[in-house]
């Protein structure tokens, strides 16, 4: 993975001029941060702030950098060789099922059940009933007694609509 | 040097259909996404959607949504408004506009304008 | 999601500088770094002035610029001149791939 490139690093006219840079494929595909042109002679770097693309590819364009959404908050912007990283707001959480938005980490748990695992940006709480030690069951039960426990995974680039 | 011409515009009666067409040139149109803003005489901005560089993504603005297909020919440099359906507030100035950000708010290039009036 | 909100003119003498308002909510303006603004001379089409915020595309004089506050987002003509006169129109990203335009204002070089 690159250095991480911020807005700072670059001048404004370089962010804002349309004209990309451009070099040589090799063996056909062209570098992280580039695309190949449409008659594969060139290699035509990304839009910095505007789009990018990760690995060697034979793509004729670079892909949408993400938006964070409200919600979330940016963990570092989108370069030309990384997309953005995205993380739901502290108190709120990534549901694998709902990965399209932040839903909110609940309060406590449910009588009978105590606390081991506390909210994090890809998790709600996590409860266990407090006589066997035993997780709740994945299935999803009366409102009043829901719990969840997403393994869930670290914060990783929102590439829902890139 | 940037150009986008658009065309097809012209009066049609409620709930008719109309074609428009935007043709590039001065850039490679395929690297870009495009997107279409109206303008209703003597009123402001209103962008209406915009689509992907090879068309696999498109969006729209909620008052268009199931009337309007946007869809483009990378072979023929040009961008397409399918209307249908149209209504007296569709009556608008349509332009086309390279869409630099892909989201519709970074519009660097625009063309002139189709005139577009629904009338019966 | 509603338009934003733009004075429907401002004015100010050659040499002088004018400050026209944009104001969203924390949903668009608020929320996001990505408010642009466009001029349009009569019967023409809409030029990129500023994007994300304060940014200049190239070619566009230094005369113009762009902030932004909270909720409100403003360009500054400074150094005004008759070719100046024009409509103005700020746009903001507002989530959801939506972009939506402020109602224009009128600047009148007097």
């Known amino acids: 993975e690159s250095a991480l490139i911020t807005q700072q690093d670059l001048a404004p006219q370089q962010r804002a001029a349309p004209q990309q840079k451009r070099s040589s494929p090799s063996e056909g595909l062209c570098p992280p941060g580039h695309h190949i042109s449409e008659d594969g002679r060139d290699c035509i770097s990304c839009k910095y702030g505007q789009d990018y693309s990760t690995h060697w590819n034979d793509l004729l364009f670079c892909l949408r950098c993400t938006r964070c959404d409200s919600g979330e908050v940016e963990l570092s912007p989108c370069t030309t060789t990384r997309n953005t990283v995205c993380q739901c707001e502290e108190g709120t959480f990534r549901e694998e099922d709902s990965p399209e938005m932040c839903r909110k980490c609940r309060t406590g748990c449910p009588r009978g059940m105590v606390k081991v695992g506390d909210c994090t940006p890809w998790s709600d709480i996590e409860c266990v009933h407090k006589e066997s030690g035993t997780k709740h069951s994945g299935e999803v039960p009366a409102v009043e007694e829901t719990v969840t426990s997403s393994p869930g995974t670290p914060a990783s680039p929102c590439s829902l609509s890139g | 040097e940037v150009q986008l011409v658009e065309s097809g515009g012209g009066l049609v009666q409620p709930g008719g259909s109309l074609r428009l067409s935007c043709a590039a040139s001065g850039f490679t149109f395929s690297s870009y996404w495009m997107s279409w803003v109206r303008q209703a005489p003597g009123k402001g901005l209103e962008w209406v959607a915009n689509i992907k560089q090879d068309g696999s993504e498109k969006y729209y603005v909620d008052s268009v949504k199931g009337r309007f297909t946007i869809s483009r020919d990378n072979a023929k440099n040009s961008l397409y408004l399918q209307m249908n359906s149209l209504r007296a507030e569709d009556t608008a100035v349509y332009y086309c506009?390279?869409?630099?950000?892909?989201?519709?708010?970074?519009?660097?290039?625009w063309g002139k304008g189709t005139l577009v009036t629904v009338s019966s | 999601q509603s338009a934003l909100t733009q004075p429907p003119s401002a004015s100010g003498s050659p040499g002088q500088s004018v400050t026209i308002s944009c104001t969203g909510t924390?949903?668009?303006?608020?929320?996001?770094?990505?408010v642009s603004w466009y001029q349009q001379h009569p019967g023409k089409a809409p030029k990129l002035m500023i994007y994300?915020?304060?940014e200049r595309p190239s070619g566009v004089p230094d005369r113009f610029s762009g902030s932004k506050s909270g909720n409100t987002a403003s360009l500054t003509v400074s150094g005004l001149r008759p070719e100046d006169e024009a409509d103005y129109y700020c746009?903001?990203?507002?989530?959801?791939?939506?972009?939506?335009f402020g109602g224009g204002t009128q600047l009148t070089v007097l």
């Open positions: 994300e915020v304060n």
């Open positions: 924390s949903s668009d303006i608020g929320n996001y770094n990505y």
């Open positions: 746009s903001s990203y507002a989530g959801n791939n939506a972009v939506i």
């Open positions: 506009a390279r869409d630099f950000s892909g989201y519709g708010d970074y519009l660097d290039y």
